[in-house]
Interface confidence: medium
Amino acid sequence: MAERAALEELVKLQGERVRGLKQQKASAELIEEEVAKLLKLKAQLGPDESKQKFVLKTPKGTRDYSPRQMAVREKVFDVIIRCFKRHGAEVIDTPVFELKETLMGKYGEDSKLIYDLKDQGGELLSLRYDLTVPFARYLAMNKLTNIKRYHIAKVYRRDNPAMTRGRYREFYQCDFDIAGNFDPMIPDAECLKIMCEILSSLQIGDFLVKVNDRRILDGMFAICGVSDSKFRTICSSVDKLDKVSWEEVKNEMVGEKGLAPEVADRIGDYVQQHGGVSLVEQLLQDPKLSQNKQALEGLGDLKLLFEYLTLFGIDDKISFDLSLARGLDYYTGVIYEAVLLQTPAQAGEEPLGVGSVAAGGRYDGLVGMFDPKGRKVPCVGLSIGVERIFSIVEQRLEALEEKIRTTETQVLVASAQKKLLEERLKLVSELWDAGIKAELLYKKNPKLLNQLQYCEEAGIPLVAIIGEQELKDGVIKLRSVTSREEVDVRREDLVEEIKRRTGQPLCIC
């Protein structure tokens, strides 16, 4: 202990010496030398356990969910799950961690964002980065060639997230995928339909779904003269076109990524286009692009896709956008991304989207990566970016100062006089047994005013009030919290009356 005190004194003295030298404007070499000594002393000192205050917080990029946030989240999940089920999906779950080998080589540059776990008994493990690769592993492992499934679970990314924009290191993904050999573009069109249904149902604002095809991108880059080695990096530049001007993107490609200016110019001609089926038709006439086998396949499929999207009534929400170049290594065909359209104060503040709220595409080769014989199972799917949606919904509710119910309690069992705890307990139990969501205050003799106040705060619509007179008459006073209207209901009719008033089915079968 005395040794530590002596070291602390030395640190203090050396600190003063460094400050003095700085004030005297001593030479940089001398200051550097003395700072090095100070750091050495500090290192010897080490952390003082008694002084180290433990900061109570959640790890970087994570958050707790309050009851209010959970209520929002459950509403959002409910909309999504109902849509997935409406489209005939089954549900699966997979482990939160996978063998490291399973995830390696599937995410390209993003692999550095995978969380590796410390060795647990010989297996090298990683936290899942998304739900798609585990799904592909599941298909290969179970030799499945045909499934329509959804999966809602947390994924983990060692990112530097902007949490204010709804981005985290631990976050939920809601995935829907169709695996199997089917006629072209029918499952792809359904995925886009699902995306539109969900985003419309959530009422989070107007949105646009950008569509492109990996094969068109490959073909376009090939005819423009982009080497395979530069494909990924040029894709990431092009993908910024929804945020910055072509001039800036071009400067990055030429200045930072070493692309020849004439190659960049050719790319610019293509990627500055968006439209509907007419653009697909225009590109099918393009003398260069139509000579590229991959691009031609992609354009043919997109033409078909637009036919189906028109039949599904969502073609006005879709934009064929040649700058959509994002996405993971595993996409092989159609790719799409939904962005919310916002109303910025001035142009130049994120011109169109507030960021992606859903994305997906076709990945026909992923399952084959896990199959010993490389057997392919064509897949197409989508992922809803629920964290961003939660943020948007929360902000909107805050702006509207809307009260969110965090419980589903239908009725509070209350008493108007003292010494009625036993009666309250009996009644609440009857209600629970009948499937009614009910509560009571945990006090022997609560004041009626406090009980009514609790209902208002918690948004409980009804109060069942027991009083001595009511007990004699065999009735319960049922009070509406909002209208304050009271009626006497016979005890045997109470369950039915509560169900009628709260719109609950009369039997819990």
Partner: antibody
């Protein structure tokens, strides 16, 4: 600052030809799609044609297809519209405009226009 | 081709008034819509793009809203320099078409 100046307009007989030019300055010309838009006297606006930045992606309104040709010379920062087989209904003020990617097909800067009169 | 229909074709208003101009598309165009202002003998000037985004340098009294097939341009408090003709234009698919225009006149 961005400037677009059209020239080449004038009086021409039906069936005749005319070549419009647009001189651009104040921005990197080759990085932008350019377009011609016209406005008949006392009437609304009509998108005529556009051309991409470098290897000349072009598109035309049905009303001018096969008769008009859009082109550009990036070295000279110039945009052109070659108009052949002119008709009475081509009489209009022709504007050249630059448009931006984020909102493709939105003219963010326009020239003052040049008047083309087709009349016998 | 996508048809764009503006209403009214002309409107009379006074300085300080709030004015709303409507534009309808013959089919859904999401938010691919722009509004322009044109004064006699001058080139059109871009006011609003992407249905509701204000072009740099345009006063904040101009605002746009709508999506799909129905759009509006609102001038919250008319200024003397706002008397002009206003055009909407769809940018969803070529040929990019304009509305027939709305002439805003002094009452």
């Amino acid at each position: 600052q961005v400037q677009l100046v059209e020239s080449g307009g004038g009086l021409v007989k039906p069936g005749g030809s005319l070549r419009l030019s647009c001189a651009a300055s104040g921005f990197t010309f080759s990085d932008y799609y350019m377009t011609w838009i016209r406005q008949a006297p006392g009437k609304g606006l009509e998108w005529v044609s556009y051309i991409s930045g470098s290897f000349a992606y072009t598109n035309y309104a049905d009303s001018v297809k096969g008769r008009f040709t859009i082109s550009r010379d990036n070295a000279k920062n110039s945009l052109y519209l070659q108009m052949n087989s002119l008709r009475d209904e081509d009489t209009a003020v022709y504007f050249c405009a630059r448009y931006v990617y984020q909102v493709v097909a939105i003219g963010d800067y326009w020239g003052q226009g040049t008047l083309v009169t087709v009349s016998s | 081709d996508i048809q764009m229909t503006q209403s009214p074709s002309s409107v009379s208003a006074s300085v300080g008034d709030r004015v709303t101009i409507t534009c309808r598309a013959s089919q859904g165009i999401s938010s691919w819509l722009a509004w322009y202002q044109q004064k006699p003998g001058r080139a059109p000037k871009l006011l609003i793009f992407a249905a509701s985004s204000l072009q740099s340098g345009v006063p904040s009294r101009f605002s746009g809203s709508g999506s799909g097939t129905h759009f509006t341009l609102t001038i919250s408090s008319l200024q003397p320099e706002d008397f002009a003709t206003y055009y909407c234009q769809q940018a969803k698919s070529f040929p990019y078409t304009f509305g027939q225009g709305t002439k805003l006149e002094i009452k």
